[in-house]
């Protein structure tokens, strides 16, 4: 006989509530003469043998109740035209039972931890009952073709709920599962599978970038937030309030909104769905300066790319702290943003940044009732050499035959550093030029004692890694000064 | 590199005068400032210049009788320190960084330092 659950030519296990006996076979190779089947009790009536006639081209057979007892042993086995068709099996009608599909109920728990997890309660199947079923569970995303399944299997005398994790929002599922005796044999068939769809998520975290505190008219922000799963097309729905007023933008992309003016808060949700978390409302209110951060410094830290930050608190506690930089010239969307609590007075940015590039860093106080932000700082990772020396231009004469001229500043990115100092430079025709340097604070010069002739006038700035080229020249023409400038 | 050197210190009757040089070589630095330790406390930050820009800030407690200065002829910052009181005892140090903002005498910005010199002053 054949070791009881491995699978062979002939098996037969125990179906439904009913708990008749379906025994199968791989197709015969002479199909016009039907098989007969034998089954005999071992456990009961070891002396009485069944028949059961199979129709004529079925490779299957139902064993009726009446012909066995419920918890008994069977030998079975089959002839065909008298010849026996296959080695006896034997079959345990306790442990050979197909069990019913578990019933999957359709309230499913979706929790968002470390990762989107769905939570699953279901029932055993009715049939058989009173025994300890063990039951296996699978889910895939609705659309693919191939499931997964959950590990580890669940048994029915304690009915864990199904757990999975690693889900994708705005994703629909479906879950389905089968179950089979302990130690016994064969699976049940799969479920009808039970269908869900995840949430979007909310935004992580939720900013303004730009000048939501400018009082000087040139107010320019932008709401921005950070995509919970980049991978995930989403768009969203963005609400901004003030006393009665209350706008909505719809269908936005990420992850980015213009702020309108006057607005005190904003709100950020997936566009098409009810999330499970209340959206983070995030006050846009300028609170009063001596609430900012102060002493705010910024340096290059010693052995890492980064860039360290510190300050120092205003005249309360805020409930967190943010500290944002932007690259010089980037646009309002390109900022990058970190959140510290209450008791952090310092951080080091992450990320690379490069050398002789500034960075306007801000430290904002956030408080339920709004923000406060200290003045920006610019800061650089490493100054470098600048790329460009100032334009030079003449004002009228002070006192009259006496030149003024001026110079502006480099642009920022071309500075590439703080200006230490200027350097202005003259050069009359056929003799050497004569270089002065002045205060970075200075922009103008006064040019005394000049003697008649023509001359070429430019300016240089510097930073801590050195002197820059000289910026556009200037030609003076002067008929009149006798005194030669030195 | 920046390297740093300190000079200058001593001991000194309450209400004289010294002064402190400290020489600077090597570049990308913007700031230097004159930090002090006494034995038994933190270290604090007393005087700091902005180099180029000339900018200056001093400790409350010892605004109007130190003043810190930079000499480019030289490549020193110089700390020029009146009405010396005992409570002035420690080791000053200068340190030097590349500085924005007005974290003018946080310590921690300041990723360069000299071996210090001692300062007593007696009542």
């Known amino acids: 006989t054949r070791p009881h659950g491995s699978p062979g030519p002939l098996q037969c296990y125990s179906v439904g509530p009913l708990g008749i006996l379906n025994c199968s076979w791989e197709p015969l190779g002479d199909l016009e003469t039907p098989p007969v089947l034998y089954h005999q009790s071992q456990k009961y009536h070891p002396n009485r043998v069944w028949e059961v006639k199979v129709p004529s081209k079925q490779s299957w057979v139902t064993i009726p109740r009446e012909q066995f007892t419920m918890a008994d042993k069977l030998l079975i086995w089959g002839t065909q035209k008298g010849r026996p068709l296959w080695s006896s099996v034997s079959v345990n009608l306790e442990t050979q039972m197909k069990p019913d599909t578990p019933q999957i109920f359709s309230q499913v728990d979706i929790s968002e931890e470390a990762t989107l997890e769905a939570t699953v309660q279901w029932a055993p199947p009715v049939w058989p009952p009173q025994k300890v079923l063990i039951c296996q569970f699978r889910y895939k995303e609705c659309q693919a073709e191939t499931w997964t399944r959950l590990e580890p299997q669940l048994k029915t005398d304690g009915l864990t709920p199904v757990e999975m994790q690693n889900l994708e929002p705005g994703t629909c599922y479906q879950v389905s599962g089968r179950c089979q005796v302990e130690n016994g044999y064969p699976w049940g068939e799969w479920s009808s599978p039970l269908s869900f769809q995840t949430p979007f998520l909310d935004p992580e975290d939720v900013w303004v970038s730009g000048t939501v505190c400018e009082t000087s008219g040139k107010r320019a922000a932008l709401l921005v937030w950070k995509d919970p799963r980049p991978c995930v097309q989403v768009t969203y729905t963005v609400w901004f309030g003030a006393g009665d007023i209350t706008t909505t933008q719809e269908e936005v992309p990420c992850c980015k909104s213009p702020v309108p003016a006057w607005m005190e808060w904003a709100v950020v949700s997936p566009g098409n769905s009810t999330s499970w978390v209340p959206p983070t409302n995030l006050s846009l209110v300028c609170l009063a300066p001596e609430s900012a951060p102060c002493d705010v410094g910024v340096s290059s830290a010693d052995g890492s790319p980064g860039i360290k930050v510190t300050w120092k608190q205003g005249t309360r506690k805020p409930l967190e702290y943010v500290v944002d930089w932007a690259q010089d010239g980037d646009s309002l969307d390109k900022l990058n943003w970190t959140r510290l609590p209450p008791g952090n007075l310092s951080t080091l940015l992450p990320g690379e940044f490069k050398g002789g590039v500034p960075y306007r860093i801000t430290v904002t106080a956030v408080y339920s009732g709004g923000l406060a932000a200290a003045p920006s700082v610019w800061g650089f990772r490493e100054e470098l050499v600048p790329l460009a020396g100032p334009a030079v231009w003449r004002l009228p004469d002070d006192p009259p035959g006496t030149p003024v001229v001026a110079w502006g500043e480099v642009p920022r990115h071309q500075l590439r550093g703080q200006a230490t100092h200027y350097t202005f430079c003259i050069q009359s025709r056929g003799l050497s030029t004569v270089c002065r340097n002045v205060s970075s604070q200075t922009q103008t010069a006064t040019l005394p004692n000049l003697h008649l002739g023509s001359f070429k006038l430019w300016v240089t700035v510097s930073t801590v890694a050195g002197q820059g080229p000289p910026g556009p020249n200037l030609s003076l023409h002067l008929p009149d000064n006798r005194i030669r400038w030195k | 590199q920046v390297q740093l050197q300190e000079s200058g210190g001593g001991s000194v009757q309450a209400g004289g005068s010294l002064r402190l040089s400290c020489a600077a070589s090597?570049?990308?630095?913007?700031?230097m400032g004159w930090f002090r330790q006494a034995p038994g406390k933190e270290r604090e930050g007393v005087a700091a210049?902005?180099?180029?820009?000339?900018?200056?800030y001093y400790a409350d407690s010892v605004k109007g009788r130190f003043t810190i200065s930079q000499d480019n002829a030289k490549n020193t910052v110089d700390l020029q320190m009146n009405s010396l009181k005992p409570e002035d005892t420690a080791m000053y140090y200068c340190?030097?960084?590349?500085?924005?903002?007005?974290?003018?005498?946080?310590?921690?910005?300041?990723?360069?330092w000299g071996q210090g010199t001692q300062v007593t002053v007696s009542s």
């Open positions: 340190a030097a960084g590349l500085v924005y903002g007005e974290a003018w005498l946080d310590s921690r910005h300041y990723n360069k």
């Open positions: 090597g570049y990308s630095i913007n700031r």
């Open positions: 210049i902005s180099i180029g820009g000339g900018r200056t």
